[in-house]
């Protein structure tokens, strides 16, 4: 079953390569277990950036080596992606699945264009 | 008389606060004197950033204290805006006027969204 997912059109990564955005879903049912997946689309290729399954109201638990962190609040997920470089500029799509209890719902946002600018290196301190 | 002006939708300023983009116009006539104006639109307010009048094939001459520099090549103007800070993020509109000889033509682009990220300060070198 389809579900509406909203996310901002554009976000700028800060100079430390960190970008944050909110992914909001219009929950048609009362889900307890939710899965959020961040996909990156670049040059018509889609790759999975990170994913987390969480219980409503809890922190999102990503794998230890993930570049993502997040928190949930109601039907909003606050996602932060770190370690971004200029080459990571692209469209980051938020996919939300209401996993359990049934019925299963899935929604995909239109994507957030994340722009990343590599910082200038600091001068050597001699 | 109206004239089509094309410019990129999005440009990122680099970490030194410099953003460059090309403003291209479809010249209906053979102009020798051209005027280029960069306008910034933010919060529904439009302000002039810089302007230069140039003879076709010549350098663009902006005022000494201008934050803009540029070169021209045929119907293309390569604009560079420097000294940008995060607060300068906004829509930069290219306006081109074919001043001489008559007839006068004027065209306005759809604007280039320039994103600016302030760099992290470098650590003190003690």
């Amino acid at each position: 079953k389809a579900m509406h997912v909203a996310q901002p059109a554009v976000v700028l990564a800060n100079s430390r390569g960190i970008a944050s955005f909110v992914c909001e879903y219009a929950s048609p049912g009362k889900a307890t277990e939710v899965r959020v997946t961040v996909l990156r689309q670049a040059d018509s290729q889609v790759t999975e950036v990170c994913a987390a399954t969480y219980m409503m109201g809890n922190e999102l638990t990503f794998l230890d080596d993930s570049i993502c962190t997040g928190t949930s609040s109601g039907n909003q997920v606050n996602l932060t992606i770190q370690g971004l470089r200029a080459m990571d500029t692209g469209l980051y799509i938020c996919k939300v699945e209401l996993m359990y209890p049934p019925p299963y719902y899935m929604g995909i946002g239109n994507g957030t264009q994340i722009y990343v600018i590599d910082p200038e290196p600091c001068p050597d301190s001699d | 008389k109206a004239m089509h002006v094309a410019q990129p939708a999005v440009v990122l300023a680099n970490s030194r606060g410099i953003a460059s983009f090309v403003c291209e116009y479809a010249s209906p006539g053979k102009a020798t004197e051209v005027r280029v104006t960069v306008l910034r639109q933010a919060d529904s307010q439009v302000t002039e950033v810089c302007a230069a009048t140039y003879m076709m094939g010549n350098e663009l001459t902006f005022l000494d204290d201008s934050i803009c520099t540029g070169t021209s090549s045929g119907n293309q103007v390569n604009l560079t805006i420097q000294g940008l800070r995060a607060m300068d993020t906004g829509l930069y509109i290219c306006k081109v006027e074919l001043m001489y000889p008559p007839p006068y033509y004027m065209g306005i682009g759809n604007g280039t969204q320039i994103y600016v990220i302030d760099p992290e300060p470098c650590p003190d070198s003690d």
Partner: antibody, heavy 120, light 107 residues
């Protein structure tokens, strides 16, 4: 009546394999998550893993101590969930229960358990 | 992993007594906590879910409370059939984990 019945337990040598089965009846099996929980004789309960439903592509979760050795699968057409146990260790000796995860996430229905003994 | 610590580990009480068992999580688990009763030779039986919701068919003498990290199971008036081992379980985060159990014995 809602019921779960485990089978397939027995004696196996360390390094060996065993496949446990859990047959469900009395409810729409395909709509539920199914879990395996084990209990070393005289000790406490340890969650082994979970199989999600078809809508969630039968994805699974495991406790770290069995990850890579145990695999949970299910056959909705047979109302059954399975626990394939490979590279068994003596510390896997336990009574293995299957349980249904209700929509409120309680493990509300349990089987009677099947005993697995890993010994040389 | 989230550690669940029950106290006491064992408890002696008399028929008619009111007893309380506590369970502490090593981190915030919201209200994603369940309580089970297990008698020797039997499978565990679900008593409480979501910290305080009574499982269908479970008598109201059982009650649960708490949120975050500290939880309690209370049995208001002990009957002979209540002497068993009780386990708490968190289902906030994978892997799901149980407490070590509290053995309730007749005094």
């Amino acid at each position: 009546e809602v019921q779960l019945v485990e089978s397939g337990g027995g004696l196996v040598q360390p390094g060996g394999s065993l496949r446990l089965a859990c047959a469900a009846s009395g409810f729409t099996f395909s709509d539920y998550y199914m879990d395996w929980v084990r209990q070393v004789p005289g000790k406490g309960l340890e969650w082994v893993g979970r199989s999600r439903d078809k809508a969630n592509s039968f994805t699974t979760e495991y406790v770290a101590s069995v990850k890579g050795r145990f695999t949970i699968s299910r056959e909705d057409s047979k109302n059954s969930v399975y626990l394939q146990m490979n590279s068994l260790k003596t510390e896997d000796t336990a009574v293995y229960y299957c349980a249904r995860t209700n929509y409120d996430f309680s493990l509300d229905v349990w089987g009677q358990g099947t005993t697995v003994t890993v010994s040389s | 992993d989230i550690q669940m610590t029950q106290s006491p580990s064992s408890l002696s009480a008399s028929v008619g007594d009111r007893v309380t068992i506590t369970c502490r999580a090593s981190q915030d688990i919201n209200n994603y906590l369940a309580w089970f009763q297990q008698k020797p030779g039997n499978a565990p039986k679900s008593l409480i879910y979501a910290a305080s919701s009574l499982q269908s068919g479970v008598p109201s003498k059982f009650s649960g409370s708490g949120s975050g990290t500290d939880f309690t199971l209370t049995i208001s008036s002990l009957q002979p059939e209540d002497f068993a081992t009780y386990y708490c379980q968190q289902y906030s985060t994978y892997p799901i984990t149980f407490g070590q159990g509290t053995r309730l014995e007749i005094k």
